[in-house]
Amino acid sequence: KIDACKRGDVTVKPSHVILLGSTVNITCSLKPRQGCFHYSRRNKLILYKFDRRINFHHGHSLNSQVTGLPLGTTLFVCKLACINSDEIQICGAEIFVGVAPEQPQNLSCIQKGEQGTVACTWERGRDTHLYTEYTLQLSGPKNLTWQKQCKDIYCDYLDFGINLTPESPESNFTAKVTAVNSLGSSSSLPSTFTFLDIVRPLPPWDIRIKFQKASVSRCTLYWRDEGLVLLNRLRYRPSNSRLWNMVNVTKAKGRHDLLDLKPFTEYEFQISSKLHLYKGSWSDWSESLRAQTPEEEPTGMLDVWYMKRHIDYSRQQISLFWKNLSVSEARGKILHYQVTLQELTGGKAMTQNITGHTSWTTVIPRTGNWAVAVSAANSKGSSLPTRINIMNLCEAGLLAPRQVSANSEGMDNILVTWQPPRKDPSAVQEYVVEWRELHPGGDTQVPLNWLRSRPYNVSALISENIKSYICYEIRVYALSGDQGGCSSILGNSKHKAPLSGPHINAITEEKGSILISWNSIPVQEQMGCLLHYRIYWKERDSNSQPQLCEIPYRVSQNSHPINSLQPRVTYVLWMTALTAAGESSHGNEREFCLQGKAN
């Protein structure tokens, strides 16, 4: 009720707190001598529900029956209206609409750690829309009882503040929660448990790992636990993995040997604890320990390939290339690669350690039989050496793969296909597909890529280091013992018409014909593999169609003769380049007049 209603009263029957769906009677009555000019028939009493007029009556009192009130609080205000004056407030009252509490469900109690306190949680059920008090009761052996009340509005948790001890771990305790509000009360089903049921150990702490003799195979995990812990769960995984390895151990006493860790790998370790085989719950997982396992000597062997280049009559350049070992094969940080070059007949050998590179170039005599061995070394040792006899990889024409083709296969992939060599195909021990960006002038600094293919394969998808709009020189080698044959082709993953035409840099006259020389189109403007050049010419100031000569593209070619020009006629000449996607724009125009005699 609004405090200090001097002019009258508002009363609510049967109660100002009602169950949802109930009906109430509201009465507004004026106190003596509080009406309009003391004439009661002029009194107009008006009942408002908040700000909405719901009833009125002339006289000293007003009765109203109200139904359908919503959950929550509704304010009713009674006002008096007299002729020729504003309405004045007489009094007011709130009606509280709610429901009785539902039975609390799923009561469960837990004690975090042996030194913790007992706390219980439950589900309240639907909101009552009234102040609802919860009382939690715990009874134990020897008629001991504890009780705690919750004054919080949405109460579903209470901590007794008492600690259960393991003196009699099988003793029974019973918890019950009761909800009470103005419309009723309800109690949960009792929950009965023992010390072992509800104590949830603290997670293990102070986790450490030790590797005996810096070896991954002798690894022990150490941790600290509460005194009564019987079981532990260990989980561990490489830091870059989402999947855990799980181990259950009993009576570990704070240590466990791990036997299946990989070398030189960062792991994450976590441990959880439990007091009893089948009672109680697991602790939370401990904080993670991150640790790197020690190195072990590399396993596996390097994939090695090579290129030979003729220098002069007595010398040749050998370029060796190798691929990094996988992380699981390297088993540590590779400190250097050891390359040994040996002349097989004379026994001369030279060894070199290479750091920071996966290639090595040297010059050797063209005579003799040469072999190389390459291995990778980390702090613990070296991989087994990969041995290769240096031979002429393309010498055996009968071993050359046939009908080599290279076709674009989606984004940044090229599918290379071939037919086995004419010579007995079963003699092929393996194919090697090699590719490198095509650079006019055969630049030896261009990175080399390769993959190995089994002898029964006649195709390979190359995708490593493949860029769009770049032309690659692709070779397929067939290897058989100490012989090799090869075939090559140009290929690209994506192409379009070149961005520019060749630049004519000179036109010279030779015996009645001309020789045109040009600069290659920059690689970044070729937009794929060039197929042809076209040379166009027409008489200056003529509107006739130009004549043209189409030349198949060859990497090293940058000049071509034309012998169909008339003497003493001035011609305009230009060039274009073509890929499979189309023709470039014109290169520069040059004028030329042949001085020689007419044929």
Epitope: G72, T73, E94, D127, H129
Partner: nanobody
């Protein structure tokens, strides 16, 4: 037990504005209405505005169109924004939380509208 503390009152010229605040202690207020009342000298305390727990506002005729009530349950605070103030709005303004166990009132904050 709920305590209520009003603030924001003061002297303002006719036509001016004030914003009153009322902060509660004890989170039970979030399920109840929060109300503003006022009491002018020599008069009884009268209702001005209410806001339900779900945020629905209601106003007495004298406040409608000029006053706005709002609440912030996280801060357990109710506000009354008063615009176009008139001399007859001069009063002590009280905040109230009605519960089925009884009403909780603040101490009040004085609003004076005068030129």
């Amino acid at each position: 037990q709920v305590q209520l503390q009003e603030s924001g009152g003061g002297l303002v010229q006719p036509g001016g504005s004030l914003r009153l605040s009322c902060t509660a202690s004890g989170n039970i207020v979030s399920i109840y209405n929060m109300d503003w009342y006022r009491q002018a000298p020599g008069n009884q305390r009268e209702w001005v505005a209410s806001i339900t727990s779900s945020g629905d506002p209601y106003y007495d005729g004298s406040a409608k169109g000029r006053f706005t009530i709002s609440r912030d349950n996280a801060k357990m605070t109710v506000y009354l924004q008063m615009n176009s103030l008139r001399p007859e709005d001069t009063a002590v303004y009280y905040c109230k939380v009605p519960t089925e166990k009884g009403n909780y009132w603040g101490q009040g904050t004085q609003v004076t509208v005068s030129s």
